[in-house]
């Protein structure tokens, strides 16, 4: 009789990524005996939950039960029934819910625990939901995407797993775009930091790495374009705002009241003398940029080099991987090429915002509005923060690759925080030895 | 091990308040939320509220206008605060824990106090 | 307020015996039901979650089922320790809600 294999021992996990636009449910899965082996997790499941993000809920908390069913209905559907029970479930909140917190912690608490008794309320081991911090995002992204690009192997591999994978063992750096904060996360060339608070020690799979991160809270894409308008309006002569950074022939009405709900445009509030504005665009990239670049204060920096608003920032170093809405709205773009130099970017954007709104609306036809409005910003943004803000040049333009997935796992640092949380990222390289069920000597 | 204890008296005059103290042991009320549940023969069992462990608190809509729940989280304790009391408000009154983070079902319970409401 | 409904107020078994004990929700609960033991003088013992899913330490005779608004809990070899109460719990919507009781007796 022929040897049958013995059914792998498959472990999950759930890591839900509330972010501030909208939150998604991520299953991951790995082989049990291979736990500590690096690039073993892979993703098998996203889940985008429908509707905004939970800091939107704060005067509708009854209605968050509602809003996880059906994604946490899917998780029942994908994870065998017999492995409910040991499969652990993290929320980690990001910068939507570090803004409500600063608004109100008693709001912010509410929200977090009604999040709580939803996600308990099924058979899974739930772990709990939190605020994580701007510096944990940018370190999880980071592991998850050199764990992902096998960069903790210390295996060489004769082949390389993904098209921009070099056959070293140097890490990839991280940039994180979302709705309301940014990160950067790289290994500096320089060990010693000019600014402890950036500086973060890990010791992984046997090899210490000393990382520079940092969160840009408020400057997340969404957050941005409010302050930008907010920043605008106070120079508009009348309720109506000329703006470069949206189509020609596009309008929009704009509540006073909403442009200064967030934080973030605190420092540009003032009274004005309507309650109301009207967007209409005029699709200039030129200004848009110009316009942008008054978002990031350089004229201040109690440091060798700072990015933007005194933050340090030591010389870039190595590759990018550029994620999330970095991705989004590149890949939307059609920019993700590796072959696409920064010039050639910029002159598309160029091209891009000056399209009349009746023609963009006709030429994408399937998407939102809402979203459609806004690429036109959101590219100019992008090249704004990276080559401004991160101080990346035309030359080093080619070391940013825009990343949506590695092996099927999108970038982001869902992946990374349920590695550190369920211990899967060994200090020490684990020993290859031929004993089962990983016993190690 | 895991364990509640309810303290509070065993008499209360209708129209008076009950003030009842659940201490824990074994798990922090930072962790977990913590249920109160009450007893008795005419009405069986009937969920009364919850603290969760942030603070926030939810109340059966029938006890809301006379109900409160407050924790110290340092000293581990659970605070039950009714006003208003009749005779139909005898029973035995328990804390429960949620079995997970903030579920709404319970893996272990307090032995319970009883709770008579007379004059 | 979402009614459980346990039909049998009382249920006579014998050691060795199976038996299975009911719940009916009067609106759809999904699978948010748990069960608890009573024993006389006793505080509940919680043995089920989300309608199947067993605590550690409780014996696997007991066994849970059901999803909308019919629920079972089967005892399997009942066991004289067995004499209890049970009592079926919708977690589906506040007010949370307990079922009536089925007192379990043994011959």
């Known amino acids: 009789t022929q040897n049958k294999a013995l059914p792998e021992n498959i472990k999950y996990g759930i890591v839900l990524d509330a972010g501030s636009s909208h939150t998604s449910l991520y299953i991951y899965k790995w082989p049990a005996e291979k736990e500590n082996d690096t690039g073993v997790v892979h993703q098998v499941e996203e889940c985008r939950v429908k509707g905004p993000g939970i800091s939107k809920y704060v005067q509708k908390v009854n209605e968050i039960g509602i809003y996880l069913t059906d994604c946490m209905e899917r998780a029942r559907e994908v994870i065998p029934r017999s492995q409910h029970q040991e499969t652990p479930v993290y929320l980690g909140a990001t910068a939507g819910m570090r803004l409500l917190r600063m608004e109100s912690e008693e709001l912010a608490d509410r929200v977090l625990d009604v999040v709580e008794r939803s996600l308990s309320n099924y058979p899974f081991d739930f772990q709990g939901a939190r605020i994580i911090t701007g510096q944990e995002e940018g370190a999880y992204g980071w592991i998850t995407i050199n764990y992902l690009l096998g960069k903790f192997s210390q295996k060489t591999r004769w082949f390389s797993i993904v098209p921009y994978e070099t056959n070293n063992q140097e890490t990839f750096g991280a940039l994180d775009l979302g709705g309301a904060s940014t990160q950067i996360t790289f290994v500096p060339q320089n060990q010693t930091t000019e600014s402890p608070d950036n500086a973060l020690q890990f010791r992984l799979y046997g090899k210490d790495y000393n990382v520079y991160t940092h969160s840009f809270l408020c400057y997340g894409k969404d957050q941005a374009l409010w302050q930008k308008l907010a920043k605008d309006i106070q120079v508009a002569s009348n309720e109506i705002l000329r703006d470069p950074c949206f189509h020609p022939g596009y309008k929009k009405v704009v509540n006073v009241s909403d442009l200064y709900k967030t934080p973030c445009t605190k420092r540009f509030e003032m009274t004005l003398p309507f309650q109301q504005f009207e967007i209409q665009g005029i699709g200039n990239y030129q200004q848009c940029h110009q316009s942008v670049l008054e978002l990031f204060n350089t004229s201040y920096c109690p440091y060798s080099q700072c990015a933007f608003n005194g933050i340090f920032l030591p010389p870039l170093q190595g590759d990018f991987g550029a994620f999330s809405a970095f991705y989004f709205v590149m890949n939307f773009l059609n920019l993700t090429s590796e072959k696409v130099s920064q010039e050639k970017v910029t002159e598309m954007m160029k091209k891009f915002c000056s399209q009349p709104w009746e023609e963009i609306k006709t030429s994408y036809a399937g998407v939102k509005e809402k979203y459609l409005s806004e690429y036109c910003f959101s590219g100019t943004y992008i090249l704004s923060l990276l080559l401004q803000g991160y101080h990346f040049t035309a030359d080093s333009w080619e070391h940013i690759h825009f990343i949506g997935k590695i092996q099927g796992s999108d970038a982001g640092w869902t992946l990374g925080y349920m590695l550190n949380l369920t211990n899967m990222i060994p200090a020490e390289q684990p020993l290859s030895t031929p004993l089962s069920h990983s016993t190690y000597v | 091990q895991v364990q509640l204890k309810e303290s509070g008296p065993s008499l209360v005059q209708p129209s008076q308040s009950l003030s009842i103290t659940c201490t824990v042991s074994?798990?922090?009320?930072?962790?977990?939320?913590v249920h109160w549940v009450r007893q008795s023969p005419g009405k069986g069992l009937e969920w009364l509220g919850v603290?969760?462990?942030?603070?926030?608190?939810d109340y059966n809509a029938a006890f809301m206008s006379r109900l409160s729940i407050t924790k110290d989280n340092s000293k581990s304790q659970v605070f039950f605060k009714m006003n208003s009391l009749q005779a139909d408000d005898t029973a035995i009154y328990y804390c429960?824990?949620?079995?997970?983070?903030?579920?709404?079902?319970?893996?272990?319970w307090g032995q319970g106090t009883t709770l008579t409401v007379s004059s | 307020d979402i009614v459980m409904t346990q039909s049998h107020k009382f249920m006579s078994t014998s050691v060795g015996d199976r038996v299975s004990v009911t719940c009916k929700a009067s609106?759809?609960?999904?699978?948010?039901v748990a069960w608890y033991q009573q024993k006389p003088g006793q505080s509940p013992k919680a043995l089920i979650y989300?309608?199947?899913y067993r605590y550690s330490g409780v014996p696997d005779r007991f066994t849970g089922s059901g999803s909308g608004t019919d629920f079972t809990l089967t005892i399997s070899n009942v066991q004289s320790e067995d004499l209890a109460e049970y009592f079926c719990?919708?977690?589906?919507?506040?007010?949370?809600?307990f079922g009536t009781g089925t007192k379990l007796e043994i011959k």
């Open positions: 603290i969760l462990r942030r603070g926030s608190t």
């Open positions: 609106q759809n609960v999904g699978t948010n």
């Open positions: 989300s309608a199947s």
């Open positions: 429960a824990k949620t079995a997970v983070v903030a579920g709404d079902y319970f893996d272990y």
């Open positions: 719990q919708q977690y589906n919507s506040y007010p949370l809600t």
């Open positions: 074994g798990f922090s009320l930072t962790n977990y939320g």
